[in-house]
Interface confidence: low
């Protein structure tokens, strides 16, 4: 049998084979050693017995899509049946105190390969033998600890294969410079050591994509925006657009990248070399956001011009013969670059929202019958922008970290957006008060520290920062979410 008989049905064309040469990979026309590495068709009953205690699942992932010329990395992780794991020696053991449907196992080993390899004979001093080879007969590389690697992974794509000895997780990187654009299929077959042979335990395939477009994604965030994922934002507040380029192999690390923005609101084109930009929409409505990313990326060099005709007789050379076997014009310039582009488009909706909230006055409410240890405090609050429909106060310790009390209630506010919020404080001391006004699309927060005095008629309430605002600067990027009466801070990055 040949590798292509064993590893997959997809047969690439001769053109594909010729134009998709992967560095370090071998042609799947090579012979496969079926005696050492038996081949089972899909549905063969022997698959059921290939692993003790269940089936092993191979999970193949890649960091696709890959920009042509960059490296794409494939990772295969083996998922063992419940209660099984690989130990430091590469043996498969039952997890301690893990109960599967068979109950607790007395034998700690599922597979004790250390014992197998220690008593295996017929090897010379190098540890090399007829069975320490890959399916094509190449010997295993003797990395330190290679004996603890009990799985053989065979990767197959584009008419070529790559063999790797490993543990329960392996990683393989492939340069995509010679790979045809578009979706391609990677198939992996995994074998486990079984005495002096190998047994197939899993097969997995995954589609990966090679593209000439830079993969681009944009995150959008805005202070006071209640839901950053719904692409609805607030008028008159800056939106931060952050461009994420999917470049896991850092192919574009040394490229100059330009970002060309059109915000769809007749503000024209905005060109930047910074991946983050702020933009404020001053009108309500729906706008089409467009981004074009341009990078000068390493790329194939144009074919060299044809060499000049050879002179009829030899010319004196500057150095010994053979120093420069190529004519100067034929020496490739390895630093050729090609412009690559990426595009992103989104439709965003701009609406009114609560832009700002301030506590302008704090007043201790004199109670006719004061509670034993309780103070009522009124906060006079103003806001700008749309009219809030709810107010939440979170009372916490002076560090603003440990919530002591949280209350939300609907509010009915006039056009002037002036309201009074009354809250009770148990006991004297310093408190952090987070006050949030919200409507359907926005949340605006202000914070202040207040000092509640003892219930002494002579004492009076002090606000740490008179005039309101309090810790507003610290908290302005903070988002408050509430569900019933359980409240937590969520930092909104």
């Amino acid at each position: 049998k040949r590798f292509h008989d064993v590893l997959g049905n997809e047969r690439p064309s001769a053109y594909m084979r010729e134009h998709n040469q992967l560095n370090g990979w071998s042609s799947d026309e090579n012979d496969w050693n079926e005696k050492l590495y038996p081949v089972w068709k899909r549905g063969d009953m022997r698959w059921k017995n290939s692993w003790k205690g269940g089936r092993v699942q191979a999970v193949l992932t890649s960091d696709s899509p890959a920009l042509v010329g960059s490296n794409i990395t494939f990772v295969v992780n083996l998922v063992f049946p419940r209660c099984q794991k690989e130990d430091a020696n590469g043996n498969i053991v039952y997890e301690k105190n893990c109960r599967n449907e068979a109950g607790l196992s007395a034998d700690p080993y599922v597979y004790n390969w250390t014992a197998w390899s220690e008593d295996s004979d017929g090897e010379n001093g190098t540890g090399q033998s007829h069975h320490n080879v890959f399916p094509d007969g190449k010997p295993f590389p003797h990395h330190p600890g290679w004996r603890r690697w009990n799985f053989v992974y065979v990767f197959h794509t584009l008419g070529q294969y790559f063999q790797k000895l490993g543990r329960c997780s392996v990683r393989v990187s492939v340069n995509t410079a010679n790979v045809t654009l578009g979706p391609q299929l990677m198939e992996v077959t995994v074998y486990r050591r079984h005495g002096r042979a190998y047994v197939p335990i899993a097969q997995v395939k995954d589609v990966y994509v090679v593209t000439d477009q830079i993969p681009v994604f944009v995150t959008m965030s805005q202070k006071n925006d209640r839901n950053s994922s719904d692409e609805t934002f607030l008028k008159d507040l800056p939106i931060t657009f952050d461009v994420l380029i999917h470049d896991p192999s850092h192919f574009l690390n040394y490229s100059t990248i330009n970002y060309k923005w059109s915000f769809g609101d007749n503000t024209g084109l905005f060109v930047s070399i910074n991946h983050t930009v702020n933009h404020t929409y001053v009108l309500n409505g729906t706008f089409s956001l467009n981004l074009t990313v341009k990078a000068a990326a390493p790329g194939p060099c144009p074919p060299p011009p044809p060499p000049p005709p050879r002179p009829p007789k030899p010319t004196p050379s500057l150095g010994p013969a053979g120093d420069n076997p190529l004519g100067l014009s034929e020496i490739p310039d390895e630093n050729c670059q090609i412009n690559r582009y990426g595009h992103f488009q989104a439709t965003i909706t701009i609406v009114e929202g609560i832009l700002e909230v301030n506590i302008i006055q704090t007043t201790d409410v004199l109670m006719l019958v004061p509670g034993p240890d309780s103070s009522l405090i009124d906060f006079v609050v103003t806001c700008q922008g749309s009219i809030p429909t709810e107010v939440c106060t979170i009372i916490s310790d002076p560090t603003c970290e440990i919530t002591q009390n949280a209350v939300c209630s609907p509010v009915d506010v006039d056009e002037m957006c002036l309201l009074t919020v009354r809250r009770a404080f148990n006991g004297s001391g310093t408190y952090c008060v987070n006050l949030t006004l919200g409507d359907d699309t926005s949340l605006a927060l202000t914070s202040t520290l207040i000092s509640v005095p003892d219930r002494d008629p002579a004492s009076s309430l002090r606000m740490a920062n008179s005039g309101g605002g309090g810790l507003n600067d610290i908290f302005e990027a903070q988002k408050i979410e509430w569900h019933e009466h359980h409240h937590h801070h969520h930092h909104h990055h």
């Epitope: 017995n49 692993w51 449907e101 007395a106 034998d107």
Partner: antibody, heavy 120, light 107 residues
Framework: QLQLQQSGTEVVKPGASVKIPCKAS????????MNWVKQRPGKGLEWIGQ????????NDNGKFEGKATLTVDKSSNTAYIQLSSLTSEDSAVYFC?????????????WGQGTSVTVSS | SIVMTQTPKFLLVSAGDRVTITCKAS??????VAWFQQKPGQSPELLIY???NRYTGVPDRFTGSGYGTDFTFTISTVQAEDLAVYFC?????????FGGGTRLEIK
């Protein structure tokens, strides 16, 4: 050809023990679980336990603890169940049945059964 | 241990009829349910494993379905040779347990 060969009938006295063989052929004995199932006349099926010949790992029904012991002899590809302190409640047909590793309870091939009669 | 409640206990049908047997597990057993056929005087035979997979060589008139606690076994067109007792069995939790059986008789 795949076979699980069991002895036909065993008649034993109350309080005695009996060891029932199940000889496997035609498949990789060490790579399948061997199960034992009890069936009393006109009654349903009761799973006693299973053993993995490859390493002797067992998985037992606690109800039969002290009653049934499962063993294997890999050299002869034979699994055994030993029933001890027999009473009339133990009179039944005992089947051996193999199951694949990852479907350890899906018994895909059964012996013809051994009838045990406990009688004085 | 898991109790498998199998209904009905008895079925009297004519050849060509469609037959459905149900099994209810006392708690979820995922899809780890098998169905067996036991003809008079014979050993049980595996028909369905993993709730819905037909075992090799089993005619396609036998089907299984279900997940969690409720499982169904169907014979789409009963034939004379289907006279037997049918058992469900869960093999998710040890000890593995069988239903009480359904005796199928042909008119």
């Amino acid at each position: 050809q795949l076979q699980l060969q069991q002895s036909g009938t065993e008649v034993v006295k109350p309080g005695a023990s009996v060891k029932i063989p199940c000889k496997a052929s035609g498949y990789a004995f060490s790579s399948y679980w061997m199960n034992w199932v009890k069936q009393r006349p006109g009654k349903g099926l009761e799973w006693i336990g299973q053993i993995y010949p490859g390493d002797g790992d067992t998985n037992d029904n606690g109800k039969f603890e002290g009653k049934a012991t499962l063993t294997v002899d890999k050299s002869s590809n034979t699994a055994y169940i030993q029933l001890s302190s027999l009473t009339s409640e133990d009179s039944a047909v005992y089947f051996c049945a193999r199951s694949p590793l990852h479907l350890r309870g899906s018994m895909d091939y059964w012996g013809q059964g051994t009838s045990v009669t406990v009688s004085s | 241990s898991i109790v498998m409640t199998q209904t009905p206990k008895f079925l009297l049908v004519s050849a060509g009829d469609r037959v459905t047997i149900t099994c209810k597990a006392s708690q979820s057993v995922s899809n780890d349910v098998a169905w067996f056929q036991q003809k008079p005087g014979q050993s049980p035979e595996l028909l369905i494993y993993s709730a819905s997979n037909r075992y090799t060589g089993v005619p396609d008139r036998f089907t299984g379905s279900g997940y969690g606690t409720d499982f169904t076994f169907t014979i789409s067109t009963v034939q004379a040779e289907d006279l037997a007792v049918y058992f469900c069995q869960q093999n998710y939790y040890s000890p593995f347990t069988f239903g009480g059986g359904t005796r199928l008789e042909i008119k």
